[in-house]
């Protein structure tokens, strides 16, 4: 969470943003909040991006004004029109790329004065993992497969009998580069497994964390997945 | 050269099912939000499906629960499966990329749904 | 869901005229998000302008790009004889996913 103040004096306004995360490929939201105007048209929005010459987006008189965007950011980004009036200046961005990660700055004008915030934007890959029973495997095992993350990120093995047991020993991982040449594919088999038991595969890099959960007894399997991005952080 | 190339239209039955498929050449699909837009004889264009580069998919009101949309990231290839076909389908159906917009197109393929 | 309408539906002009043509969004519609394609017969659509004003690769200056929130305009200066047939604006990022106008047809006087 970052909060910042305009330099003005008495004249500044209070804008906050938060570490933010995209997965690449799809849209992504840069979040920045600031202290609401009546006025729509006393509103500016400025999104500006370090190491950019031109903006990446500016909003002001109540529309969009992109005569100074810059390239890298043309035909992909947007503001929430309806919700500037309340004091959201997010970012839509779509389709994101890896080269979008960096430092923005979210600068505001109103008629209560100025203010601007930091906002660290990381981009990575990050997918729900499946687990399931590995019928081809000679002994009982669990394969873990997550289709897209990028940084390459570990994978942790856990279950609830045997809490606090390293499973490295007994688990293999494989990362295998997806077509675009980025995004990789994971995979890890957990061997000699026991029924009446819940086993977790735990998927995480420096973006976001997913776990797989698979819950095997005699007479059924549970599964169950969860996806938390590492991105509310105080910077 | 960057180009697309759609296939496997053709004449079917109401209720029937098709798949077409879309080959790209100069750019990779999975990077890339790929689209399916289809336009009905003598009228305008509409927006059927979309397949961004994480694999999310939106479909229209007016084919959702019906069609599927895919891809073959080996072949670099965009898919559509058509099932329970209805006459409202017959159109020519275009795969288009988006990068900014839908700045590339194919030729279209022709699907003709009638008894 | 946002709608786009194209106005007018035919646009009967001589070549050398200028041709404006109009789409309105139901609501706001990012500047970014809307396109501009043009459709000849047999033929599959083509970008013209995206992020409301920028010309694709290609595309010649006589024709441009502006408007905001609700209110959009391709404008083409100088009508060439190549430049008859349809035109559709298009929007990104609502549900539904993309939307295009019923789309405007400029045809020879």
């Known amino acids: 969470l970052i909060i910042g103040f305009g330099i003005s004096g008495r004249h500044s306004i209070t804008v906050t943003t938060l570490t933010s995360a995209g997965n690449i490929g799809e849209d992504g939201i840069l979040s920045c909040t600031f202290e609401p105007d009546i006025r729509l048209s006393d509103i500016v929005i400025q999104w500006l991006k370090e190491g950019v010459v031109g903006l990446v987006h500016e909003f002001k008189e109540g529309k969009d004004d992109l005569s100074d965007q810059d390239e890298m950011f043309r035909g992909r980004t947007a503001v929430f029109t309806d919700q500037v009036i309340v004091g959201n200046a997010s970012l839509r961005l779509k389709n994101v790329q890896l080269t979008d990660a960096g430092t923005y700055k979210c600068y505001i004008i109103t008629s209560k004065g100025k203010g601007n915030a930091n906002l660290e934007y990381k981009t990575g890959a990050f997918s729900m993992p499946e687990v399931n029973l590995d019928y081809n495997a000679s002994s009982e095992s669990l394969r873990c497969e997550a289709p897209r993350w990028f940084p390459q990120p570990t994978v942790v093995w856990a279950s609830q009998v045997d809490q606090g047991a390293n499973f490295s020993e007994v688990s293999n991982t494989s990362f295998e580069l997806n077509s675009e040449n980025v995004t990789m594919k994971v995979v890890s088999v957990l061997y000699n497994v026991t029924v009446n038991n819940t086993y977790s595969c735990m998927i995480e890099n420096d973006i976001a964390k997913a776990t797989g959960d698979i819950k095997v007894t005699d007479s059924e399997i549970k599964r169950r997945s969860s996806l938390q991005l590492l991105n509310s952080r105080a910077a | 050269e960057v180009q697309l190339v759609e296939s496997g239209g053709g004449l079917i039955q109401p209720g029937g099912s098709l798949r077409l498929s879309c080959a790209a050449s100069?750019?990779?699909?999975?990077?890339?939000?790929m689209n399916w837009v289809r336009q009905a004889p003598g009228k305008g264009l509409e927006w059927v499906s979309v397949i961004y580069g994480s694999g999310r998919t939106y479909y229209a009101d007016s084919v959702k629960g019906r069609v599927t949309i895919s891809r073959d990231n080996s072949k670099n290839t965009l898919y559509l499966q058509m099932n329970s076909l209805r006459a409202e389908d017959t159109a020519v159906y275009y795969c288009?990329?988006?990068?900014?917009?839908?700045?590339?197109w194919g030729q279209g393929t022709t699907v003709t749904v009638s008894s | 869901e946002i709608v786009l309408t194209q106005s007018p539906g035919t646009l009967s002009l001589s070549p050398g005229e200028r041709a404006t043509l109009s789409c309105r969004a139901s609501q706001s519609v990012s500047s970014s998000y809307l396109a501009w394609y043009q459709q000849k017969p047999g033929q599959a659509p083509r970008l013209l302008i995206y992020g409301a004003s920028s010309r694709a690769t290609g595309i010649p200056d006589r024709f441009s790009g502006s408007g905001s929130g609700t209110d959009f305009t391709l404008t083409i200066s100088r009508l060439e004889p190549e430049d008859f047939a349809v035109y559709y604006c298009?929007?990104?990022?609502?549900?539904?996913?993309?939307?295009f106008g019923q789309g405007t047809k400029l045809e020879i006087k």
């Open positions: 288009a990329r988006d990068t900014y917009a839908m700045d590339v």
């Open positions: 298009q929007q990104y990022g609502s549900s539904p996913m993309y939307t």
């Open positions: 100069g750019f990779t699909v999975s990077s890339n939000y």
